[in-house]
Interface confidence: medium
């Protein structure tokens, strides 16, 4: 199986592709803002699962699915009450993933 650092690197590359592409992502669709530090990749996947018909994030969803399946989903501390653009969400996810990649633990 692929190591966690390699999967994180793959996710960083994919998210970097998305964040730098200037085309409006998923036609400006909104998703729930979630606490990534508390819920990790599983809550990110939950939030993005609500987006359909958006080819640009299919690969991200697939990578997140793999990362989430590595362990049981973490309980989110509180229900999300804010919606943000998918592009903004992806930017936050990228920052979180980079931080995890730099500092581990693996």
């Amino acid at each position: 199986s692929v190591s966690l650092p390699l999967t994180l690197k793959e996710l960083i590359e994919e998210l970097s592709n998305i964040t730098q592409d200037q085309t409006p992502l998923c036609n400006g669709s909104m998703v729930w803002s979630v606490d990534l530090a508390a819920g990790g990749f599983c809550v990110a996947l939950d939030s993005l699962t609500n987006i359909s018909n958006c080819n640009a994030i299919y690969r991200t969803q697939r990578i997140l699915h793999g990362l989430c399946n590595r362990k049981a989903p973490t309980t989110v501390s509180s229900l999300p009450d804010t919606k943000i653009e998918v592009a903004h969400f992806i930017t936050k996810l990228l920052s979180y993933t980079k931080q995890l990649f730099r500092h581990g633990p693996f």
Epitope: N17, Q22, H88
Partner: antibody, heavy 123, light 110 residues
Amino acid sequence: QIQLVQSGPELKKPGESVKISCKASGYTFTDYAMHWVKQAPGKGLKWMAWINTYTGKPTYADDFKGRFVFSLEASASTATLQISNLKNEDTATYFCARAGRTEGTHYYAMDAWGQGTSVTVSS
Amino acid sequence: DIVLTQSPVLAVSLGQRATISCRASQSVSISSSDLMHWYQQRPGHQPKLLIYRTSNLVSGIPARFSGSGSGTDFTLTIDPVQADDIAAYYCQQGRESPWTFGGGTKLELK
């Protein structure tokens, strides 16, 4: 502060090549896409291409496929534009401009520009 | 491609209001905003972002600049016009690639 510094003016003959550089400072280079924009003398702005500074992959406008190569020297925080087989109609000022969806920037807009590099093609 | 149309020249008097228009050949809207931006280019200088997403003023840009519009019709307003506002103004759409600019409107003094 954010700065994009471009290489100096160029005078070339038709058929020659030119390489223009754009050195970025004051921000994380690989977090922001880089665009190139052409402005012919007395004319308006024309978008040429953008390059993903993380992967190095360029996306071209149709009019700038073929003789134009957009590349990176990411370790030096530098984007480059090379034009081969120069023609008279390539005479213009070429600008680099950064853009991206990173928090703190203006989504989808070119928020920092280089000073421009003048390229004159004349026999 | 989305074509953006601007009037080439606008003559104004100092202290008056200048209204610069930009019309798109198709909508530049997405669900949450209108993706039209405005740039100022003084003679011999690089363009400078003034307004992004139709009406958001860039930090450090004077409040006499404002933007409005939706769909296909957009306006940049300068009120009152000052001497250092004499420049060319370009609209640019961020709705789809290829990114396109308007032909520019040159602001001139009456």
